[in-house]
Interface confidence: medium
Amino acid sequence: IIPVEEENPDFWNRQAAEALGAAKKLQPAQTAAKNLIIFLGDGMGVSTVTAARILKGQKKDKLGPETFLAMDRFPYVALSKTYSVDKHVPDSGATATAYLCGVKGNFQTIGLSAAARFNQCNTTRGNEVISVMNRAKKAGKSVGVVTTTRVQHASPAGAYAHTVNRNWYSDADVPASARQEGCQDIATQLISNMDIDVILGGGRKYMFPMGTPDPEYPDDYSQGGTRLDGKNLVQEWLAKHQGARYVWNRTELLQASLDPSVTHLMGLFEPGDMKYEIHRDSTLDPSLMEMTEAALLLLSRNPRGFFLFVEGGRIDHGHHESRAYRALTETIMFDDAIERAGQLTSEEDTLSLVTADHSHVFSFGGYPLRGSSIFGLAPGKARDRKAYTVLLYGNGPGYVLKDGARPDVTESESGSPEYRQQSAVPLDGETHAGEDVAVFARGPQAHLVHGVQEQTFIAHVMAFAACLEPYTACDLAPRAGTTD
Amino acid sequence: IIPVEEENPDFWNRQAAEALGAAKKLQPAQTAAKNLIIFLGDGMGVSTVTAARILKGQKKDKLGPETFLAMDRFPYVALSKTYSVDKHVPDSGATATAYLCGVKGNFQTIGLSAAARFNQCNTTRGNEVISVMNRAKKAGKSVGVVTTTRVQHASPAGAYAHTVNRNWYSDADVPASARQEGCQDIATQLISNMDIDVILGGGRKYMFPMGTPDPEYPDDYSQGGTRLDGKNLVQEWLAKHQGARYVWNRTELLQASLDPSVTHLMGLFEPGDMKYEIHRDSTLDPSLMEMTEAALLLLSRNPRGFFLFVEGGRIDHGHHESRAYRALTETIMFDDAIERAGQLTSEEDTLSLVTADHSHVFSFGGYPLRGSSIFGLAPGKARDRKAYTVLLYGNGPGYVLKDGARPDVTESESGSPEYRQQSAVPLDGETHAGEDVAVFARGPQAHLVHGVQEQTFIAHVMAFAACLEPYTACDLAPRAGTTD
């Protein structure tokens, strides 16, 4: 498909001249950021961004790649080096420590320097590193965590927890020996390490005692409370704040977000991770966009500003399953949340960053025609005389041999939301990838986001932009009209 | 491997604070660029950049990812959308038209708008678009093309040629009907379309009549001249300029580059593409770094400045073979050329851009330990109880079934320069990938390189920075001390 207007050189020359004009107008703001938002696309490497752009464009009846994601509109871009101290290819725990605390850690640890060792409880104490969210709170800002995973998951936990094992969601997941040594589960740390104003995502079951039925799935014992210590962490959290509200469904969330008496809001919408966007029951569970909007409504009441972490956490899960349909539809919802946040905030006073913790071994090749489905087949056949998809994985569960050979695939099969793209190597779960990821930035001090940087730089830019520790002597003018 | 110094949070905090300090000091230059250099890593997607960084670091006895490529030091980064008008995943012809001429074209066409159709000679005339190199020449600058492929290959051809078929290297490749319609081969266009001061790379055989023995392989008929028109294009080119010199080996190149009487230099060091760096005979063939240095020595004599195109063109070829060793060692030599150019030029007056035309379906995953070989195995086994490499391809010739199963691999096999990494789909040649690629920028007007842009933006930034057509009214101050 060749769009007629694109055949004319004037189309491209005019478009580029406009882009140049916009680039020339870019003026680095010399003011401090009142608000900080970090949007984290878990597993959202550059190949995921491009494929999602095409899909989002095609959902709007465009050819695809010429369209813009919300994140594409951010004026500044850098590349972020994601390796952990001990691994070339990292996990979401070590990376969360990097972009939220400004220090690199070891694989599967969270909120700890690399002096801590995975699963060794006695290496925790003294190696804690403090997140930018925690520092924002100490500076009088309101703070929030929003995710499509469980709120105790590796990425959001980087904002508040310190643990040698990212899998210690509730005390039932922590070995007795580690509990005796004083190592706390992540759910406990969620409510006790610091005061978080807004907590939205999944993860109900880690907050309640074993045997507590889940409100949404009361007959499903496996979805009920998991805690061995008998604690009801939601109750404990509610008791801490007079204006605290706990909600577990969309209707309650929308009500609470508009209620001026609510100062603290915890919404846990699934026992574990939230459902994929394509499986979400829109009457019961809010979308990531809706959770983001609710968080911003509450947090923006604080005249001193806020810090908000928003995670599209299941992009990663779709990729691990080698189900690109899930990964890409999650990415689009993540981008929709970015777009909505942009409408609800001002780039005059809000530094917004979009990045990924790491990438995936996910590729988009095969020379497909413009406008063809991102989930479709490449033109021509492979060397085994069978069709193949444009989307493929280096490794993962999509590897199948049928009668000792690679299976053929049709356009209708490859377009199914359940289809697993093929891979070179058979694994139960497709792996992360180690290449640099993009950082998109907009707002005060966004111009500092440049070049190729360590992932830790992200936390430092946020801290500096808002004059938080260790950059309280940041020498930035407060935005005109800022209240304190 | 955990470096002791990296266990200390101070290491990361100090490093990030320094990076912030450098970011704060960045001052967009308001001057015009006297010189333009575009470094094109053919097929150098972000996954290739990261893997090459690690390899280059490890060759210097470092762990790898913490080190810097020369391109990593460039202060500004953007993402470039590489699709062609007719394909989601492009080729090197359409992309060359974009980043060198500022207009997107169709797959496998060069220097033509998308109104031209692949292989249809009669759609050429009237659809030609003019490269920035051509515009630089018209403005009185010296211009050069340096590549490790044949100089008539798609990427360099974007700087001087207009053709509906990128494969028309010599007239022997052009169908008789197209020749009769007046369509010229690329080699002819190389010497006749415009005056190029420096031409360095491979591609001897396309310049000489059929039956002309090659100077390096005189007994190998298949490497001799291919032309049917009986023309000796080198002779024709030499006759155009009093100070013109033709060389075909490294010794002659080094002599010519230091000879003040040489005003124009053509060096063709192989009949076709140049050898891979790991196979290069260092007495006969120059490296990309040496060719770049030679070009800069000649071009920088012009007080009005220069335009130089430098291509690491065989990164792409290594990937097409699914031989990551070749792709990554080519990337390192490309980066070495960037480094050398940086030493020979000043960022006060030279805008340098580094980018790729497109990516490849190449991934780096599997959670390898820090410091482990980039060509090594992932920890653990795959679901078929066999080892697997951290580097893999989505598709390509590395797909093999042995006794109806995926072959096992050892560390010594995977470390071999000949090893083909496995792929999900068997193809004769691994394909390009469609995700955005990075653009790195340094020098006057480099700050305009920002955000997510169409690939065409690159040509426009260069033209604007040097006040070339259509931006002659660029309103930029000439650099202090610039002579005319």
């Epitope: - | 196979h279 005979d281 071999s416």
Partner: antibody, heavy 123, light 106 residues
């Protein structure tokens, strides 16, 4: 002109060792992959070992039948290729050739060969 | 490791005959096959590389073809000086020779 001259062959008893040499000239020795190939009496050609060039760190590869017994090495200052053969067996009796790869053709085909040196393993 | 199966092991033909020798690889070798001529007491001589490219000085009656796993050496019109043993060599993955084909004149 590329020249390869093997030496060091002769009669040796089973279980003993022998070192073959191949002196190279006419090309930049460090830039090329070098191999040893043999031909046993009445048998076909058998590739034995490879040592890569400077750019690839002079890494080595062997065929299964000689792995652990034979070692390929090179003295780049003298442009000499070696094959150290230990624990020799009667079936190692053959003419041993050294060969240089050519990269021009995008592969590593054995383009240049020496004349060979005869090794006889017998008690 | 890649195995090469060469056939026939010996071949008797008359001067002027068209002669075909085949090599089958155990896996796809991506056209990385060479053919050598070997005469007793001499070093093997490279005749064809990359499936079909003739070495300098090799008569044009020799040709090579094939792809994937199957490859062929053809002599279009056998000459007395062509009497020798011919070996194929895969060089896609290290090196493996075929068993050889001994060519004789009837």
């Amino acid at each position: 002109e590329v020249q390869l001259v093997e030496s060091g062959g002769g009669l040796v008893q089973p279980g003993r060792s022998l070192r073959l040499s191949c002196t190279a000239s006419g090309f930049t020795f460090t830039d090329y992959y070098m191999s040893w190939v043999r031909q046993a009496p009445g048998k076909g050609l058998e590739w034995l070992a490879l040592i890569r060039n400077k750019a690839t760190g002079y890494t080595t590869e062997y065929t299964a039948s000689v792995k652990g017994r034979f070692t390929i090495s090179r003295d780049n200052s003298k442009s000499i290729l070696y094959l150290q053969m230990n624990s020799l067996k009667t079936e190692d009796t053959a003419v041993y050739y050294c060969a240089r790869a050519s990269f021009y053709y995008d592969g590593k085909v054995l383009a240049y060969w020496g004349q060979g040196t005869l090794v006889t393993v017998s008690s | 490791d890649t195995q090469m199966t060469q056939s026939p092991s010996s071949l008797s033909a008359s001067v002027g005959d068209r002669v075909t020798i085949t090599c089958k690889a155990s896996q796809d070798i991506n056209k990385y096959i060479a053919w050598f001529q070997y005469k007793t007491g001499k070093a093997p001589k490279l005749f064809i590389h990359y499936t079909s490219t003739l070495q300098p000085g090799v008569p044009s009656r020799f040709s090579g073809s094939g792809s994937g796993r199957d490859y062929t050496l053809t002599i279009s019109s056998l000459q007395p000086e062509d009497i020798a043993t011919y070996y194929c060599l895969q060089y896609d993955n290290l090196y493996t020779f075929g068993q050889g084909t001994k060519l004789e004149i009837k």
